[in-house]
Interface confidence: low
């Protein structure tokens, strides 16, 4: 970005100063500003130099540079007040032409930034501004009247008050033109269309705008179509519409239709698809997978994608077991219209329980038939650990039980002294079991695994720990041996990741 | 035949809590699906929902009265009961309980008030 | 909260007339949309639910139609037992809002 000296966003001098303004960029620089006399410029590869020896009320106005070969468009400006007793405003254009409802800026430029407390616009000959003229002033820019009327074509002056007195600028004539209308305003209803070959179909094409001199047709792939055109007149706009009735429809009738309307201003269009089908169709999707993992406690939302024609006329979500026989909630179930064709529904499971594991069918029936779509929702657990004594061939063994989903990998961990958990300094030996016995592994239900430690010599003043981790968190199961037999340590809580 | 209505007093003082009950018979707010709500009309102006209980005891409020009401449900008596807080002339209304339901398709989003009390006109007033 | 507009708030028809009332909603309830008709003294009696579905029992010439947020029930003839005054409700979310109620009267 190139950058102003000196470095202020405002300058402030008298008629007659010399001032002199440098701008210095990467590459060449150039000046805009407003055109005003005795300014010399000159230029040195990188910076441009802006200067006057003789300042006058015509060189207030803002100085910008900038960077033509900077791809960014930086640029910097300086705001110039030359403040002249006599002249409290600068005039650069005296016509401004808008179109109606555009802001006009009136570029008068004040001289002087202590004047700003005291302006105000109003019409030539001191007259105050039409009612409900809104207006806002910079003394950077001038006065902005916002959203310009037509009937606000005016001579305007700026006013400012200086000594007690009201100093006007030089008149302003501002030209509102009435807007020319643009294209018209299209409607194609419907924007989708949808019928099984034999029925009825209607189409209808409507065009508006505030001049009659406007044309309107319906084409059908690049066909116009000769259809009687009805007219209206309403609330300020003329309306011509275009209602193509097809009694008995057929494939012919299919494809791409376009509303078309023309005027002076150019042409809008508008386009939507007429599917002719043999028969009802109800077709189930979902972007999910059909097959879903969550942990135990977290929530989940089913979402079913339906494009159906006709209209559904049932829809159902239902829970297929294999554990309870309740069903979804009403409340927890919603339905959502994408199009005329095509609808979402939801289930949302919040906070899930071990007997909502299970499959869940939704369910959808129009005449074309039932359809479904089934997810299978298994919950995830944090391993729970059980150890007990046992023998086995004669083998003093310890037998660990983990029950979790995803499968849990079992470890055994002994370490010295008597503790609930074995840490990293106690440990003497760590054993991982790579291929526990797999005891139950029934589908929607926890895993469960054993694991065997045979133990030739339980040491009494050691414990023995069994720990289980999936993906879920982890569990542990502490073997105490004691002269009087064994004894065993659950922890106080399984560690748990919901 | 499903019936609701409504009972309580009349006449309440400003600052003194209302407590209305909805008597019910007809259906059961133990099925499925079944809600009740409670929606008042304050004379010669609109509708205005209140609150809902559903048959899970799940209770939805008005939340620019929300810490003024309190809806519960005796389903052994068959009845449901709106408590409303610190009354004021403004609530001078007439007060409807309305059953939600029961239900064509068990998860279709159609939750509306099918049957209506005949409505308690309730005055606060000193 | 949705906010419900309902037009026009009143309105006058002769037996015969098709009649219709519309409700505007601040954003999207998906069709999640019932109306009601009340007479003097009475409660409310559940016309049209879920837009356009007619609740049993209530007469065929009352239609409900609409999508996104713009909803319309429609009489196609009025009979003298009509007039009435109407609202629309929506239980797309909470809090639930009803409409500011049309009261069609007898011209």
């Known amino acids: 970005i190139p950058v102003i000296e000196p470095s202020v966003p405002e300058l402030v001098v008298k008629p007659g100063a010399t001032v002199t303004l440098r701008c210095v960029g990467n590459g060449s620089v150039e000046w805009d500003g407003p055109p005003s006399p005795h300014w010399t410029l000159y230029s040195d590869g990188s910076s441009s130099i802006l200067s006057t020896n003789n300042a006058t009320f015509q060189n207030t106005g803002t100085y910008r540079c900038t960077e033509p070969g900077d791809p960014l468009g930086g640029s910097a400006a300086i705001h110039l007040y030359v403040k002249d007793p006599a002249r409290p405003w600068n005039v650069l254009a005296q016509e401004v032409v808008v179109f109606e409802d555009q802001d006009a800026l009136l570029p008068c430029l004040l001289t002087d930034p202590v004047l700003e407390a005291g302006v105000s616009l109003v019409r030539v000959r001191g007259r105050p501004l039409m009612r409900h003229t809104n207006y806002s002033f910079s003394p950077w820019h001038g006065f902005t009247i916002h959203r310009a009327k037509f009937i606000q074509s005016q001579d305007y002056q700026c006013s400012a008050l200086m000594g007690g007195r009201k100093v006007m600028s030089i008149s302003i004539r501002l030209k509102v033109q009435k807007v020319i209308p643009g294209p018209p305003a299209l409607t194609l209803v419907p924007a989708e269309l949808v019928r099984i070959r034999g029925e009825a179909a209607q189409i209808v094409c409507s065009a508006s705008s505030v001049d009659v001199n406007f044309d309107v047709f319906l084409q059908h792939n690049n066909t116009k179509l000769a259809i009687p055109q009805q007219s209206d007149f309403h609330n300020n706009r003329y309306q011509k519409v275009l209602t193509l009735n097809l009694d008995q429809v057929d494939f012919q009738h299919a494809g791409n239709y376009s509303c078309v309307a023309s005027n002076v201003q150019g042409k809008h269009s508008t386009s939507m698809f007429f599917r002719v089908v043999e028969s009802a169709y109800l077709n189930l999707s979902s972007e999910q997978n059909l097959i879903q993992e969550v942990t135990v406690g977290e929530g989940l939302n089913l979402k079913v994608m339906v494009e159906a024609y006709p209209g559904l006329q049932g829809f159902n979500w239902t829970y297929l077991g294999p554990f309870s026989d309740h069903q979804p909630e009403p409340k927890l179930a919603n339905a959502t219209t994408k199009d005329t064709y095509r609808h979402t529904f939801t289930l949302s499971l919040p906070r899930l329980k071990p007997s909502e594991a299970g499959r869940y069918s939704f369910l959808a029936r129009n005449p074309g038939g039932w359809r479904a779509l089934t997810f299978e929702l298994t919950l995830r657990y944090p391993p729970e650990v059980s150890v007990i004594w046992t023998f086995i061939n004669g083998s003093g063994t310890l037998l660990c039980a983990a029950s979790g989903y995803p499968q849990p990998n079992v470890t055994w961990l002994q370490c010295s002294g008597h503790t609930d958990r074995c840490d990293e300094a106690q440990v003497l030996q760590v054993w991982d079991d790579p291929y526990p016995e797999v005891l139950s592994q029934e589908p929607f239900h926890k895993v469960t695994v054993q694991s065997l430690l045979t133990v030739e010599t339980l040491e009494h003043n050691q414990t023995y720990e069994c720990r289980a981790h999936n993906s879920v968190g982890s569990g542990s199961w502490a073997f105490i041996p004691i002269s009087a037999g064994a004894h065993t340590h659950p922890p106080d809580e399984f560690l748990f990741t919901p | 035949e499903v019936t609701l209505k409504e009972s309580g007093p009349a006449l309440v003082k400003p600052t003194q809590t209302l407590t209305l009950t909805c008597t019910f018979s007809?259906?059961?707010?133990?099925?499925?699906?079944?809600?009740v709500g409670w929606i008042r009309q304050p004379p010669g102006k609109a509708l205005e929902w209140l609150a809902n209980?559903?048959?899970?005891?799940?209770?939805y409020y008005n939340p620019s009265l929300k810490n003024r009401l309190t809806i519960s449900k005796d389903t052994s008596k068959n009845q449901v009961v709106l408590t409303m807080t610190n009354m004021d002339p403004v609530d001078t209304a007439t007060y409807y309980c309305?059953?939600?339901?029961?239900?064509?398709?068990?998860?279709?989003?159609?939750?509306?008030?099918?049957?209506w009390g005949q409505g308690t006109m309730v005055t606060v007033s000193s | 909260d949705i906010q419900m507009t309902q037009s026009p708030s009143s309105l006058s028809a002769s037996v015969g007339d098709r009649v219709t009332i519309t409700c505007l909603a601040s954003?999207?309830?998906?069709?999640?949309l019932a109306w009601y008709q009340q007479k003097p003294g009475k409660a409310p009696k559940l016309l049209i639910y879920y837009a356009s579905s007619l609740q049993d029992g209530v007469p065929s010439r009352f239609s409900g139609s609409g999508s996104g947020t713009d909803y319309t029930l429609t009489i196609s003839s009025l009979q003298p037992e009509d007039f009435a005054t109407y609202y629309c409700?929506?239980?797309?979310?909470?809090?639930?809002?009803f409409g500011g109620g049309t009261k069609v009267e007898i011209k």
């Open positions: 007809g259906f059961s707010l133990t099925t499925y699906g079944m809600g």
């Open positions: 954003e999207d309830i998906y069709d999640n």
């Open positions: 409700l929506q239980d797309s979310e909470y809090p639930w809002t």
């Open positions: 309305a059953r939600i339901g029961p239900i064509k398709y068990p998860t279709a989003p159609y939750r509306y008030f099918d049957f």
């Open positions: 209980i559903w048959w899970d005891d799940d209770k």
